[in-house]
Interface confidence: medium
Amino acid sequence: FSPLRRISIKILVHSLFSMLIMCTILTNCIFMTMNNPPDWTKNVEYTFTGIYTFESLVKILARGFCVGEFTFLRDPWNWLDFVVIVFAYLTEFVNLGNVSALRTFRVLRALKTISVIPGLKTIVGALIQSVKKLSDVMILTVFCLSVFALIGLQLFMGNLKHKCFRNSLENNETLESIMNTLESEEDFRKYFYYLEGSKDALLCGFSTDSGQCPEGYTCVKIGRNPDYGYTSFDTFSWAFLALFRLMTQDYWENLYQQTLRAAGKTYMIFFVVVIFLGSFYLINLILAVVAMAYEEQNQ
């Protein structure tokens, strides 16, 4: 080993070196939070870049750059350090059009904390391992969601467009002429029935157990879907989103009530199955895989 390499190894394994890097990263993060940083922070930026460059140089001299098993670039954590340094020099010395976009990569410096703090390294390692292990569960989840999305598509396609429409039309008014002239929500409220405080027209259905319209209104299928058109089973993708919403239980009870009002109470069975399988079983299966991966990483 050359004297330079010996010195580099001594520095690298020293606890003060790790402390210095950790303090630098944390200080750098504090400086990044500044809204309008004063001019002198520019010099501090250069100092940080210098320290990171020194750290990488020490690692390269001690371990070698890329040839060999334990060299600098063979460790994925060092890829992050390398990218941070490359972007630091790029934003500073190379005149690239949209620099603000490149400055975004400064945030990666905060991620350097992970490689320095051992506990964090374990957690992130477990996270990466769990993602690898999750592939099978994810395939199963997507498959299940797809199957139920297709069932939902067949059962509820177009149902959420059902609305309670006013009976008393003027002499020459038709549904089409009305829909063409409706612009504001106030116009809609003239012809469709709205519950107090609701932003969508009252949903209804044509089956005996679906929601009925109040007196003076009949059920028609026209206009857009509820929630600005985002809630529907009209296409596979919208149905898939609705199923994902059920699985994650994201305001799912509203979707449940809307669909049951438009399609009928019988379809409660569909929601029971989806919630049990998707929300209770699959979500817990994902959590179990993550927990297993973390346990393995700890051992």
């Epitope: 396609m157 177009g158 429409f165 009976n167 044509f206 007196e215 009949t218 299928k221 026209i222």
Partner: nanobody, 120 residues
Framework: EVQLVESGGGVVQPGGSLRLSCAAS????????MAWYRQAPGKQRELVAY??????ISYADSVKGRFTISRDNSKRVYLQMNSLRPEDTALYYC???????????????WGQGTLVTVSS
């Protein structure tokens, strides 16, 4: 393609009666509301009466007590016209708000019209 076919029109004396019928032909998933309109020569088309699936019925003031609208099944509507007057002379149109199939939106459909002439 869905079509509305009216029948029952003709010439009748004042005070007489007529029964108009309207049937929806073709594929029909759901009929929401059926109505009768009329258009007298040189006048605008006006609503005579309508009936909804829930049984809501409404009549124009000029025909109240004389005309009766009814619906025997989801595809057919009738207009029983009693005590006819000369001013009832018009072309009577059937109109329905219906869905041809479960995937289509509700649309307005008109019949071709049937002529009712009240004269002595």
């Amino acid at each position: 393609e869905v079509q509305l076919v009216e029948s029952g029109g003709g010439v009748v004396q004042p005070g007489g009666s007529l029964r108009l019928s309207c049937a929806a032909s073709g594929p029909v998933f759901n009929i929401n509301r059926m109505a009768w309109y009329r258009q007298a020569p040189g006048k605008q088309r006006e609503l005579v009466a309508y009936v909804t699936p829930t049984g809501d019925i409404s009549y124009a003031d000029s025909v109240k007590g004389r005309f009766t609208i009814s619906r025997d099944n989801s595809k057919r509507v009738y207009l029983q016209m009693n005590s006819l007057r000369p001013e009832d002379t018009a072309l009577y149109y059937c109109r329905a708000l219906l869905q041809p199939d479960s995937y289509s939106n509700t649309r307005t459909y008109w019949g071709q019209g049937t002529l009712v002439t009240v004269s002595s």
